[in-house]
């Protein structure tokens, strides 16, 4: 806490300017009017205040707005935003996308801080859902943002917002997240033609069921191996050798290099060796000729 002391004669600040960097902590506290600071917050960003001086400025705003800062002040916080705690930010009501952008800009190029995470959480909860403009903004600043959300949180993303998602935004998503996002993407892109549809849906395919993969195999999509390796194992296992060949097109040769990795390894174990041999890739580990395959999962379902 900074002690309350009278401002020395002639030192009362008439505006927020660079002369204030020469003020001691107690002088800043005594000589800068909090209301003046609030109206001239945008100037702080251009003044090289020390960390200690920033603490004093924050303290002044906290006293002026004990229930939380108004958006007019929040929008111009600049690097003072980084002195805020998550507890401070939980008091705010940020509704403007411009305010969100201004504060994200302060932390641009760095990983998401606790302050930023709290700010985004407050903003999204206030809006009720992750609309396209918000998602556009968040993924522009934090490509991994979408994958930081739980499947429950992702369920509030409307299909229309999926248009804002870029392939790199999904790089760190796990299968549970893609399970939620894939149906939304399928809905969002449903009116596109074959090749355009595949380009858009490709990065979401880690959540695709077997029947959709079978359908894609009939469309000459030439899926690359990187995409194939991210598919759900349980979705890949029922595919026939012919379907995988059609799905991958010229990329089918890449299966050899991946034969020891999932889902390729598990898929090979489910195929007849005869069928695998037709690919001419030397894939080994299939079911030997003459063996009968019993689908026990089907048997259990029937009993």
């Amino acid at each position: 806490e900074v002690e309350k002391t009278a401002c020395p004669s002639g030192k009362k600040a008439r505006e927020i300017d660079e002369s204030l960097i020469f003020y001691k902590k107690w002088e800043l506290e005594a000589c800068v009017d909090a209301a003046l600071l609030a109206t001239q917050m945008d100037r702080v960003n251009a003044i090289p205040f020390t960390y200690e001086q920033l603490d004093v400025l924050k303290h002044k705003l906290d006293e002026l707005y004990p229930q939380g800062y108004p958006e007019s002040v929040i929008q111009h916080l600049g690097y003072l935003f980084l002195k805020m705690s998550p507890e401070d930010i939980r008091k705010w009501n940020v509704t403007s996308l411009e305010t969100l952008k201004a504060l994200l800009e302060v932390n641009k190029g760095h990983e998401m801080s606790p302050q930023v995470a709290t700010l985004i959480d407050r903003f999204v909860k206030g809006r009720g859902q992750l609309d396209k403009d918000t998602l556009d903004t968040l993924t522009a600043f934090y490509p991994g943002y979408l994958c930081s959300l739980s499947p429950e949180e992702l369920s509030s993303v409307p299909p229309s917002s999926i248009w804002a998602v870029r392939p790199q935004d999904l790089d760190t998503c796990d299968p549970r997240q893609l399970d939620v996002l894939y149906p939304k993407a399928r809905l969002a892109f449903q009116n596109m033609n074959g090749s355009e549809y595949f380009v858009k849906i490709q990065s979401f395919l880690g959540g695709a069921p077997t029947e959709d993969l079978k359908a894609l195999s009939q469309q000459n999509v030439s899926m690359d191996l990187a995409t194939f390796m991210k598919l759900r194992t349980d979705a890949v296992l029922p595919l026939t050798v012919a379907e995988v060949q059609k799905l991958l097109g010229p990329h089918v040769e890449g299966l050899k290099a991946e034969e020891r990795h999932r889902p390729v390894r598990d898929w090979i174990l489910r195929q007849r060796q005869d069928d695998l041999d037709t690919l001419g890739l030397g894939l080994q580990g299939g079911i030997p000729n003459g063996y009968l395959v019993l689908d026990l999962s089907m048997q259990e379902a029937l009993s």
Epitope: A46, I47, P48, F49, T50, Y51, E52, Q53, L54, D55, Y79, L82, K83, S85, K108, G109, H110, S113
Partner: antibody, heavy 119, light 107 residues
Framework: QVQLVESGGGVVQPGRSLRLSCAAS????????MNWVRQAPGKGLEWVAV????????YYADSVKGRFTISRDNSKNTLYLQMNSLRAEDTAVYYC????????????WGQGTLVTVSS | DIQMTQSPSTLSASVGDRVTITCRAS??????LAWYQQKPGKAPKLLIY???SLESGVPSRFSGSGSGTEFTLTISNLQPDDFATFYC?????????FGQGTKVEIK
């Protein structure tokens, strides 16, 4: 007068860890930001990381992100750099340096400690 | 991250010469630029901050100018003690980046 003294350097194998320390005196340590800057043999200066006065914000160079952690103990006037998964290219003299605010330069530097990553 | 490019990388000069080193930022950094001097085996020393402000105790023959993306360090009357490597550094973003350095050597 301001004094910064680094320690903890030495020879370490690739993949191993090392922790550097920087003991500060002559100023109010808890008021100022602290940085690590390194210099590979015969090369230029490379900024590594910064930590704000109260430890609330930490920023890293892309080359060390996820491997190095900057921290401080204001009660001991000491800055730390925890270096994990060390690589040959991390071989350098490591300097600690002070800044007084987000828009302040590095006004005081230690003399550095040499870290050699080699098998 | 903001990239800093210094030129030249080496500069040969004589005592009494006027020497100019330039530094270019990959994006605007306003005036948040510092210049440092480093001698072999020693820590860097701050010379100039905020593009043109002289650090206390630094001789007045050192001066800096520029803003935005283009900056210069000038040594007006090179002294024997000035032969060293000089670095620019931006501190506009929390990732503070250095230029690659300019070595000023005796001609």
């Amino acid at each position: 007068q301001v004094q910064l003294v680094e320690s903890g350097g030495g020879v370490v194998q690739p993949g191993r860890s090392l922790r550097l320390s920087c003991a500060a005196s002559g100023f109010t340590f808890s008021s100022d930001g602290m940085n690590w800057v390194r210099q590979a043999p015969g090369k230029g200066l490379e900024w590594v990381a910064v930590i704000w006065n109260d430890g609330s914000n930490k920023y890293y160079a892309d080359s060390v992100k996820g491997r190095f952690t900057i921290s401080r103990d204001n009660s001991k006037n000491t800055l730390y750099l925890q270096m994990n998964s060390l690589r040959a290219e991390d071989t350098a003299v490591y300097y600690c340096a002070r800044d007084r605010g987000p828009l302040w330069p590095l006004d005081y530097w230690g003399q550095g400690t040499l870290v050699t990553v080699s098998s | 991250d903001i990239q800093m490019t210094q030129s030249p990388s080496t500069l040969s000069a004589s005592v009494g010469d006027r020497v100019t080193i330039t530094c270019r930022a990959s994006q605007s950094i306003s005036r948040w630029l510092a210049w440092y001097q480093q001698k072999p085996g020693k820590a860097p020393k701050l010379l100039i901050y905020k593009a043109s402000s002289l650090e206390s105790g630094v001789p007045s023959r050192f001066s800096g100018s520029g803003s935005g993306t283009e900056f210069t360090l000038t040594i007006s009357n090179l002294q024997p003690d000035d032969f060293a490597t000089f670095y620019c550094q931006q501190y506009n973003s929390y990732s503070r980046t250095f230029g690659q350095g300019t070595k000023v050597e005796i001609k």
